[in-house]
């Protein structure tokens, strides 16, 4: 004979659990139906009647199968430094995440409670570790032979250009300035000679620094929202 299917509410066997999408009601001492996501228990079960569910009202939600008497309130509207990545619906809470250029300094179950602007490394310092959704930028001083002339949360230290003849040596916050070489050899007819560095860089490409015999002096600066680390600016 097939096993008899129990309809909610029913008394479970001693030691046995209720089935999926059911719960044991301590007051009724019966297995009763849960309410689906987007609903809540309007009337609780008794020994003779099952749970009565109702839809969540506006600005409230339930994400799980449940038996709560009232739906949960959606979180407050996202602040100006946040973007709403998930709207409040009857089945899910609003989720706020930090807008570009900001990171989450204090997270919550889902989304972010407090956003903070990404640290900007000042000239002479470059990004050692880029910011993420949940961590700030780490700045480091530019090592000998490299420089950064920007205040930026993304720019790394780039190698100085290599000159045939140096007009102004580079430092941590300024590129080397090359001078034209004089006089140059004669060239093939029609060729035009422009003074230029031996190697050129694109402003936007990740550099591959030349091997250097100078010892590296780079180190990571401490993280933390306040005060601004040396080599960084809160602007």
């Amino acid at each position: 004979l097939p096993a008899q299917v129990a309809f909610t509410p029913y008394a479970p066997e001693p030691g046995s659990t209720c089935r999926l999408r059911e719960y044991y009601d301590q007051t009724a001492q019966m297995c009763c139906s849960k309410c689906s996501p987007g609903q809540h228990a309007k009337v609780f079960c008794t020994k003779t009647s099952d749970t009565v569910c109702d839809s969540c009202e506006d600005s409230t939600y339930t994400q799980l199968w449940n038996w709560v008497p009232e739906c949960l309130s959606c979180g407050s509207r996202c602040s100006s430094d946040q973007v709403e990545t998930q709207a409040c619906t009857r089945e899910q809470n609003r989720i706020c995440t930090c807008r570009p250029g900001w990171y989450c300094a204090l997270s919550k179950q889902e989304g972010c409670r407090l956003c903070a602007p990404l640290r900007k490394c000042r000239p002479g310092f470059g990004v050692a570790r880029p910011g993420t959704e949940t961590s700030d930028v780490v700045c480091k001083p530019c090592a000998p032979g490299t420089f950064s002339n920007t205040t930026s949360s993304t720019d790394i230290c780039r190698p100085h250009q290599i000159c045939n003849v140096v007009a102004i040596p580079g430092n941590a916050s300024m590129d080397a300035v090359c001078t034209s070489t004089s006089p140059t050899r004669s060239m093939a007819p029609g060729a035009v000679h422009l003074p230029q560095p031996v190697s050129t860089r694109s402003q936007h490409t990740q550099p591959t620094p030349e091997p250097s015999t100078a010892p590296s002096t780079s180190f990571l600066l401490p993280m933390g929202p306040s005060p601004p680390a040396e080599g960084s600016t809160g602007d």
């Epitope: 659990t17 209720c18 059911e22 719960y23 044991y24 009601d25 301590q26 007051t27 009763c32 849960k34 609780f44 339930t62 994400q63 799980l64 199968w65 449940n66 038996w67 709560v68 008497p69 949960l72 179950q109």
Partner: nanobody
Framework: QVQLVESGGGLVQPGGSLRLSCAVS????????IAWFRQAPGKEREGVSC????????WYADSVKGRFTISRDNAKNTVYLQMNSLKPEDTAVYYC??????????????WGQGTQVTVSS
């Protein structure tokens, strides 16, 4: 797959103490209230204690107030029940259960195999 595994039960003399642990897997404690209930042979399930997911607020049955303490460690996904001044009438199998979003009204969605607590001299 939701799993709750109780441990820490045993035989203890009246007035003694035990600490029960409930290791939770398959879901995060951030969302669920967790309850302890007990069942003695031939008796109905009795709610003992519950701790909510949102604010960590707690509920205790009158019979255990002042003697039992429930706590949770979300990082370890574990809930504890510290039982002091145990009495013979506390003898039962103790179960931990997911209590849904909150502790009231008390109910259990799923629970573990239980751990036996025996208080006897």
């Amino acid at each position: 797959q939701v799993q709750l595994v109780e441990s820490g039960g045993g035989l203890v003399q009246p007035g003694g103490s035990l600490r029960l642990s409930c290791a939770v897997s398959g879901f995060t404690l951030d969302y669920y209230a967790i309850a302890w209930f007990r069942q003695a042979p031939g008796k109905e399930r009795e709610g003992v204690s519950c701790i909510s997911s949102s604010d960590g607020s707690t509920w205790y049955a009158d019979s255990v107030k002042g003697r039992f303490t429930i706590s949770r460690d979300n990082a370890k996904n574990t809930v504890y029940l510290q039982m002091n001044s145990l009495k013979p009438e506390d003898t039962a199998v103790y179960y931990c259960a997911d209590a849904g979003y909150q502790c009231t009204p008390l109910g259990y969605g799923s629970w573990g195999q239980g751990t036996q607590v025996t208080v006897s001299s």
